[in-house]
């Protein structure tokens, strides 16, 4: 026998209370798919989240995260604070970079500059805060022999960053 | 959306190498850091090191230092996890996660085995 | 590094507050999160920084963080709740994420 709740469209729900008929989900909440027998309570966006798509009787609420703060985990689940490049988020609040590590990101940690001298190059242009170091040619006296294998990740000093 | 994508299971003898991948998609994969956690049989989550992608800068917890060798391409937008001499002791799943601090999504996690 | 310890095991009855602790030297100086793992399943955020909720988790659970430790509590626990919980933190001293031993939460009955 066929289930009669499998009638209910989207939007609605079979109310048991009403002899399994389907009654309209009722305001602040949803049903995306049919034969349900209940509807889901829409998502709510406060504090840092804001509202990116309304709930709708079919959809739940979207949020995003108001400015200021960056999206985390499935469907904007979480919001993040920004920082500045050349900054890594703390704590206790945005830091700068210490001597020797960038961030070129608004979110992120520091990460050291690349240490050019152990690809046997000389620093081409010297980093800052928000860049890395940009490396050049191989320094003076340096023979491609002496390492014919490039190492597959920067080489760099470990840097030190804020508390 | 966002998915993380782990290679399959493997099982390994003792001393044979492994290359295990972790691929992204669904997001800016250069930017974002990828961190791999190992979770031995009926044990607790260890983070083993962490890669971001955009210049493959590495940092490897202590105790993983010199044991494993964590990469990435983002060409192809996949982060790598390799041993060049497998143990017993390696046998546990190994899962990849984006990010440093919170881990926002995780891959579905990559069984190995090394058994003689 | 920081080390961060949980309890092995924490029993609770259906309706009533669980509470797991993760304790490290200082542990408030640094953001905590917390991570719900079930049999066979990847960890989720279910706290992050101390005391936020990701929209999806139940309001029954929250954080705290000070000193030298941080506690998940979750309130009115329901049989579903049943699963791993694991403390992590961020340390700027060697730039690393460690995490607690784990603690297996039983829902009696």
């Known amino acids: 026998l066929q289930d009669p709740c499998s009638n209910c469209p989207a939007g609605t729900f079979c109310d048991n209370n009403r002899n399994q008929i389907c009654s309209p989900c009722p305001p602040n909440s949803f049903s995306s798919a049919g034969g349900q027998r209940t509807c889901d309570i829409c998502r709510q966006c406060k504090g840092v989240f804001r509202t990116r798509k309304e709930c709708s009787s079919t959809s739940n609420a979207e949020c995003d995260c108001t400015p200021g703060f960056h999206c985390l985990g499935a469907g904007c689940s979480m919001c993040e604070q920004d920082c500045k490049q050349g900054q890594e988020l703390t704590k206790k609040g945005c830091k700068d970079c210490c001597f020797g590590t960038f961030n070129d990101q608004k979110r992120g940690i520091c990460r050291p500059w690349t240490n050019c001298s152990l690809d046997g190059k000389s620093v081409l242009v010297n980093g800052t805060k928000e860049r890395d170091v940009v490396c050049g040619p191989a320094s003076a006296g340096f023979s491609p022999g002496t390492s014919s294998v490039t190492p597959p990740a920067p080489a760099r000093e470990p840097g030190h960053s804020p508390q | 959306q966002v998915q993380l994508v782990q290679s399959g299971a493997e099982v390994k003898k003792p001393g044979e190498s492994l290359k295990i991948s972790c691929k992204g998609s669904?997001?800016?994969?250069?930017?974002?850091?990828i961190s791999w956690v190992r979770q031995m049989p009926g044990k607790g989550l260890e983070w083993m090191g962490k890669?971001?992608?955009?210049?493959?800068?590495?940092n490897y917890s202590p105790s993983f230092q010199g044991q494993v060798t964590i990469s990435a391409d983002k060409s192809i937008s996949t982060a790598y996890l390799q041993w060049s001499s497998l143990k017993a002791s390696d046998t546990a799943m190994y899962y990849c996660?984006?990010?440093?601090?919170?881990?926002?999504?995780w891959g579905q996690g990559t069984l190995v085995t090394v058994s003689s | 590094d920081i080390e961060l310890t949980q309890p092995p095991s924490v029993s609770v009855a259906p309706g009533q507050t669980a509470r797991i602790s993760c304790s490290g030297d200082?542990?408030?100086?640094?953001?905590a999160h917390w991570y719900q793992q079930k049999p066979g399943q990847a960890p989720v955020v279910v706290i992050y920084?101390?005391?936020n909720r990701p929209s999806g988790i139940p309001e029954r659970f929250s954080g705290s963080n000070s000193g030298n430790t941080a506690t998940l509590t979750i309130s009115g626990t329901q049989a579903e709740d049943e699963a791993d919980y694991y403390c992590?933190?961020?340390?700027?001293?060697?730039?690393?994420?460690?995490f607690g031993g784990g603690t297996k939460l039983t829902v009696l009955g």
């Open positions: 996660a984006r990010g440093y601090g919170i881990f926002d999504y």
């Open positions: 669904g997001y800016s994969f250069s930017t974002y850091w």
């Open positions: 890669i971001y992608p955009g210049d493959s800068y590495t």
């Open positions: 200082n542990i408030g100086d640094q953001y």
């Open positions: 920084q101390d005391k």
């Open positions: 992590s933190t961020y340390t700027f001293v060697g730039f690393t994420t460690v």
